[in-house]
């Protein structure tokens, strides 16, 4: 992980300066280096029952380095901390331990959930919704026109999505009945949504002039061409299918 | 709870010598690095020195070297800093501060002031 | 040595105020930044260390950022006992420097 690490090289006498191996400025044949060239870190590794002297690129995982004037040193960290500001500041904490405030924890304290992607005590975000909309214009069948009765929707934006243990979101969009006056549809406004559409021919079934839905017309002041019940309906579709079968025939 | 309570700090003629004390508790003071930083009436901190956490090592700012010197005793988890030669610039509080990189402990001062 | 320069020295604000206070070092330091704030009378006391990690403690209305050479110390909503003076320090090697300060003071 570091480069440049230096160890004893061959037998010498415990204070010998020739013959380092490595970023070693001086070194024994005991303590490995006991000081490095410029701009290494020093750091004492433990092997078995002795320290033995490195010098480093940079410090080691669970180890910070201070810079001081005649030597850079590497410092260890706390046991349960992976990479630390210095001995009080914790800044990445070992596996199974969650940072919060510079200090390693076994679990988040309440009020705050463990972000197991950054292993931090984050706190806990609950769900944010916009003001609603305005309703939307009232339609059936994504029509404006031709009928009385129909729905409009209202929605609302997510501001802030929750974190895991946060409040869920409430609905985003709502749909109620609406009532409209009335009204002819005028050439070309069949389309969906009140969008301008021109249709060559009326679909099998449909009349050219609006049908209000049955009940609509429970409560509709009836115009007399509209005055017709269901059989007379049902009679005046057959009546254009077969209109539109000898239009046919004769061709 | 950790605390740092200097002492030592008065009024003293130039040339003259002063010692100022440091007792530490609330946290273990042999695994700290302790620094002195003063601060001059109305003016900004300014670091003064700092001694490693054995006594092995010490640094100092320019304008103190040769004058200063800064000793602990961690059987006594106390800091000193023996002021020599003060001069009318040297007027400050002087803080007391466990030093790891950052200031992380400070004491509440003891006010040093170097007048004829 | 590394010299710290921060900007403004004094700033007016009024409580609920956004502030930001900028620090200069004169060579990169990566992170190793550490902001204090201090009260007359008052020891300074360590707000973020590692340029943007608040100390345990402190609210979460201060935060800070920056890397290298440019640093900043921002409060989100100025409240009453924010009035003081900050100080950053750079900790990336010795000897410690501090900025000059900057004095926050009541509009």
């Known amino acids: 992980q570091n480069a440049s690490r230096g160890r004893r090289q061959r037998r010498m006498h415990p204070n010998v300066s020739q013959g380092c191996q490595g970023g070693c400025a001086t070194c024994s044949d005991y303590n490995g280096c006991l000081s490095c060239k410029p701009r290494l870190f020093f750091a004492l590794e433990r092997i078995g029952m002795k320290q033995i002297g490195v010098c480093l690129s940079s410090c080691p995982s669970g180890y910070y380095g201070t810079r001081y004037p005649d030597i850079n040193k590497c410092t260890k960290c706390k046991a349960d901390c992976d990479t630390c500001f210095n001995k009080n500041f914790c800044t990445k904490c070992k596996s199974g331990f969650y940072l919060h405030l510079g200090k390693c924890l076994d679990n988040c304290p309440e009020g705050l959930e463990a972000n197991n992607h950054t292993m931090e005590c984050v706190s806990i975000v609950h769900c944010e919704v916009s003001e609603w909309n305005p309703w939307s214009p009232c339609t059936k069948k994504g029509k404006t026109c031709g009928f009385k009765r129909g729905t409009e929707t209202r929605v609302r934006e997510i501001i802030q999505h929750p974190s895991a243990k946060g409040n869920l979101c409430p609905p985003t969009n709502e749909t109620r009945k609406c009532t409209v006056q009335r009204k002819k549809c005028q050439k070309g406004e069949r389309g969906k949504k009140g969008r301008e559409r021109k249709r060559k021919k009326p679909n099998k079934g449909e009349s050219k002039e609006a049908i209000p839905d049955s009940k609509s017309l429970e409560s509709s002041k009836e115009i007399p061409e509209q005055r017709e019940n269901k059989q007379q309906q049902k009679k005046r579709k057959v009546q254009d299918k077969q209109k539109s079968v000898s239009v046919s025939t004769v061709h | 709870e950790v605390q740092l309570v200097e002492s030592g700090g008065g009024v003293v003629q130039p040339g003259r010598s002063l010692r100022l004390s440091c007792a530490a508790s609330?946290?273990?003071?042999?695994?700290?690095?302790m620094a002195w930083v003063r601060q001059a009436p109305g003016k900004g901190l300014e670091w003064v020195a700092t001694?490693?956490?054995?006594?092995?090592?010490?640094y100092y700012r320019d304008s103190v070297k040769g004058r200063f010197t800064l000793s602990r005793d961690n059987s006594k988890n106390t800091l000193y800093l023996q002021m020599n030669s003060l001069r009318a610039e040297d007027t400050a509080v002087y803080y007391c501060?466990?030093?790891?990189?950052?200031?992380?402990?400070w004491g509440q001062g003891t006010m040093v002031t170097v007048s004829s | 040595d590394i010299q710290m320069t921060q900007s403004p020295s004094s700033l007016s604000a009024s409580v609920g105020d956004r502030v930001t206070i900028t620090c200069l070092a004169s060579?990169?330091?990566?992170?190793?930044l550490v902001w204090y704030q201090q009260k007359p009378g008052k020891a300074p006391k360590l707000l973020i260390y590692?340029?943007?990690r608040l100390q345990d403690g402190v609210p979460s209305r201060f935060s800070g950022s920056g890397f290298g050479t440019d640093f900043t110390l921002t409060i989100s909503s100025l409240q009453p006992e924010d009035f003081a003076t900050y100080y950053c320090?750079?900790?990336?090697?010795?000897?410690?420097?501090f900025g000059q300060g900057t004095k926050l003071e009541i509009k």
């Open positions: 590692a340029a943007s």
């Open positions: 320090q750079q900790s990336y090697k010795y000897l410690p420097t």
């Open positions: 501060a466990a030093h790891d990189r950052s200031f992380d402990y």
């Open positions: 060579e990169d330091i990566s992170n190793d």
């Open positions: 609330g946290f273990t003071f042999s695994d700290y690095d």
């Open positions: 001694i490693i956490y054995d006594g092995s090592r010490t």
